[in-house]
C-alpha cells in the first residue's frame, strides 16, 4: 500500500501531510518536521518519526542477559538531524552546542562533547533485544504459539522479514524478542530492525504510528497478550565509547 489514493493518506505513518501533488496527480506524503517525502508502502525511518514527533504540538534462564555493551535509550526524545535518506546523522547536537555520537537507531553511544566532537561513521545497531513483561494470564502461553504469533506480527504489521527475528524467548511472564540484522544481510527494500522495533515500541505504548488502524491487539490462540513493561537494548557492530566516569 502506497499513499492511499482515495482519501490521500499514508497508511504507515500518520505523522505526515499528504496531497495529490505527485506525478500525474498522485498522492504524495511528506513527514512533519522535515518535509521529506516518505514511502507509504513501508515503515518510515525512526529519525524522520522522531523529528515529526518533536515538531508536533506537545499536548498529546533461557532468557538473554544483555551484554556489557548493550545500550538503553535513557536520553529520551530529542530533535534529530537526519540525512537525505532519512537516517540519523552520526553526530547530533542540541541548541546549546552540546554534541554526541549516535548509532543507527539514534541512541547516544559516546559521552557528550562540544562542536569539536567527531563522529566518523554511523555505527550500525545489528542486534536489538526487546524485553517484555506480560500481564498475568490464566496460565503460561505455549512458547511455540507465542513464537509463531510474534513472528507473524513482525512479518505482517511491520513487514520485517522472518530471518531478522532471530529468536523469541519465554519465561513467564518475560518475553524476549531478538532482532538481528547485519549490514551485509540487509538488502534494498528490507525494513530496518531499528524502525520495526520503534514501531513496535510505540504500538506497545498505545501510540500507534499507523494511519487509522486500531492499536495493537495481540492474541495467542484467542488469549490476549497484554504487555505491562518494555525495555529495549541495542547492540552495535562496534562497541560504544563511554568514559569510565559514566560506568561508576
Amino acid at each position: 500500500h502506497t499513499a492511499a489514493q482515495d482519501n490521500c493518506t499514508c497508511p504507515t505513518n500518520k505523522m505526515t501531510v499528504c496531497s495529490p501533488d505527485g506525478p500525474g496527480g498522485r498522492c504524495q506524503c511528506r513527514a512533519l518536521g522535515s518535509g521529506m517525502a516518505v514511502d507509504c508502502s513501508t515503515l518510515t525511518s525512526k529519525c524522520l518519526l522522531l523529528k515529526a514527533r518533536m515538531s508536533a504540538p506537545k499536548n498529546a534462564r533461557t532468557l538473554v542477559r544483555p551484554s556489557e555493551h548493550a545500550l538503553v535509550d535513557n536520553d529520551g526524545l530529542y530533535d534529530p538531524d537526519c540525512d537525505p535518506e532519512g537516517r540519523f546523522k552520526a553526530r547530533q547536537c542540541n541548541q546549546t552546542s552540546v554534541c554526541w555520537c549516535v548509532n543507527s537507531v539514534g541512541v547516544r553511544r559516546t559521552d557528550k562533547g562540544d562542536l569539536s566532537l567527531r563522529c566518523d561513521e554511523l555505527v550500525r545497531t545489528h542486534h536489538i533485544l526487546i524485553d517484555l513483561r506480560h500481564r498475568p494470564t490464566a496460565g503460561a502461553f505455549n512458547h511455540s504459539d507465542l513464537d509463531a504469533e510474534l513472528r507473524r506480527l513482525f512479518r505482517e504489521r511491520y513487514r520485517l522479514h522472518p530471518k531478522f527475528v532471530a529468536a523469541v524467548h519465554y519465561e513467564q511472564p518475560t518475553i524476549q524478542i531478538e532482532l538481528r540484522q547485519n549490514t551485509s544481510q540487509k538488502a534494498a527494500g528490507d525494513v530496518d530492525i531499528g524502525d520495526a522495533a520503534y514501531y513496535f515500541e510505540r504500538d506497545i505504548k498505545g501510540e500507534s504510528l499507523f494511519q487509522g488502524r486500531g492499536g495493537l491487539d495481540l492474541r495467542v490462540r484467542g488469549e490476549p497478550l497484554q504487555v505491562e513493561r518494555t525495555l529495549i537494548y541495542y547492540l552495535d557492530e562496534i562497541p560504544p565509547k563511554f568514559s569510565m566516569k559514566r560506568l561508576t
Epitope: 511455540s144 513464537d147 509463531a148 505482517e156 522472518p162 486500531g214 490462540r221
Partner: antibody, heavy 117, light 111 residues
Framework: QVQLQESGPGLVKPSQTLKLTCTVS?????????WNWIRQPPGKGLEWIGY???????LYNPSLKSRVTISRDTSKNQFSLKLSSVTAADTAVYYC??????????WGQGTLVTVSS | DIQMTQSPSSLSASVGDRVTITCRAS??????????LHWYQQKPGKAPKLLIY???NLESGVPSRFSGSGSGTDFTLTISSLQPEDFATYYC?????????FGQGTKLEIK
C-alpha cells in the same frame, strides 16, 4: 465444535466479481485466530488467497492482491471473499479455513466456482 | 515466495507398507523454537485435513501411524503401516513467510 461453511454462486461470468461468504459456527471470528480463503483449481494444488484476522487486519497473496478483498460481518459471524475481474483461470474449488498459529486446523467443505460465459 | 517441492509426485504402495513422503523448501522454514511446516491429507471431493503441524506434532484424532520429522528445508511425512483409508493426496505447507505456500502434492495409490 468449530464449523465453516462456504456459500455463493457456482457460476460467474468473465470480467465479473466473484463473491463468496464463509459462515462460522462454534467460535466467534472476532475472538481470535485468522480466517482464510484457499483455492484449488480442478486437478491441481492448493493456493492461499489471504486472510482477515480477529481484529480485522488483512493479509493477501501478492499474486492476487490487486483483485482481492476479504471482509467480515461480526454480527453474522461471517467473512467474505471478493475477487474482481475473473477469468477462466479463477475456476476452482474455494475453501475457507481457520488458521490457528499459522496452520489450517478447520476447513469448510469447499464450493466450486466456474468462470464461464 | 518460498517454493515447496514434494517427492515423489505419486507412489503406489500396498496395505501394511511403510511409506515416506518428502518435502523440500527453497529456504529455511524453521525458527529457534518452531518449524513452520505442516502436512495435510486430501481425499477426492473433500477438503484437506490437517495431519501434522509444526513438522512433528500429531493433530488431535489423527492415527499414530502418521509421523513427521525434519527441520530447516527438509521434511518427511511417514506412514508406518498403510491402511486402506490412507490412499489419498498429501500436501505440505509452509507458514514461515507470506504468502503461505503448498507443495504440489503426492498422490498415494494402491499397488
Amino acid at each position: 465444535q468449530v464449523q465453516l461453511q462456504e456459500s455463493g454462486p457456482g457460476l460467474v461470468k468473465p470480467s465479473q466479481t466473484l463473491k463468496l461468504t464463509c459462515t462460522v459456527s462454534g467460535y466467534s471470528i472476532s475472538s481470535g485466530y485468522y480466517w482464510n480463503w484457499i483455492r484449488q483449481p480442478p486437478g491441481k494444488g492448493l493456493e492461499w488467497i489471504g486472510y482477515i484476522s480477529y481484529s480485522g487486519r488483512n493479509l493477501y497473496n501478492p499474486s492476487l492482491k490487486s483483485r482481492v478483498t476479504i471482509s467480515r460481518d461480526t454480527s453474522k459471524n461471517q467473512f467474505s471473499l471478493k475477487l474482481s475481474s475473473v477469468t477462466a483461470a479463477d475456476t476452482a474449488v474455494y475453501y475457507c479455513a481457520r488458521d490457528t498459529t499459522a496452520y489450517f486446523d478447520y476447513w469448510g467443505q469447499g464450493t466450486l466456482v466456474t468462470v464461464s460465459s | 515466495d518460498i517454493q515447496m517441492t514434494q517427492s515423489p509426485s505419486s507412489l503406489s504402495a500396498s496395505v501394511g507398507d511403510r511409506v515416506t513422503i518428502t518435502c523440500r523448501a527453497s529456504e529455511s522454514v524453521s525458527s529457534s523454537v518452531n518449524r513452520f511446516l505442516h502436512w495435510y491429507q486430501q481425499k477426492p471431493g473433500k477438503a484437506p485435513k490437517l495431519l501434522i503441524y509444526r513438522a512433528s506434532n500429531l493433530e488431535s484424532g489423527v492415527p499414530s501411524r502418521f509421523s513427521g520429522s525434519g527441520s530447516g528445508t527438509d521434511f518427511t511425512l511417514t506412514i508406518s503401516s498403510l491402511q486402506p483409508e490412507d490412499f489419498a493426496t498429501y500436501y505440505c505447507q509452509q507458514s514461515n513467510e507470506d504468502p503461505y505456500t503448498f507443495g504440489q502434492g503426492t498422490k498415494l495409490e494402491i499397488k
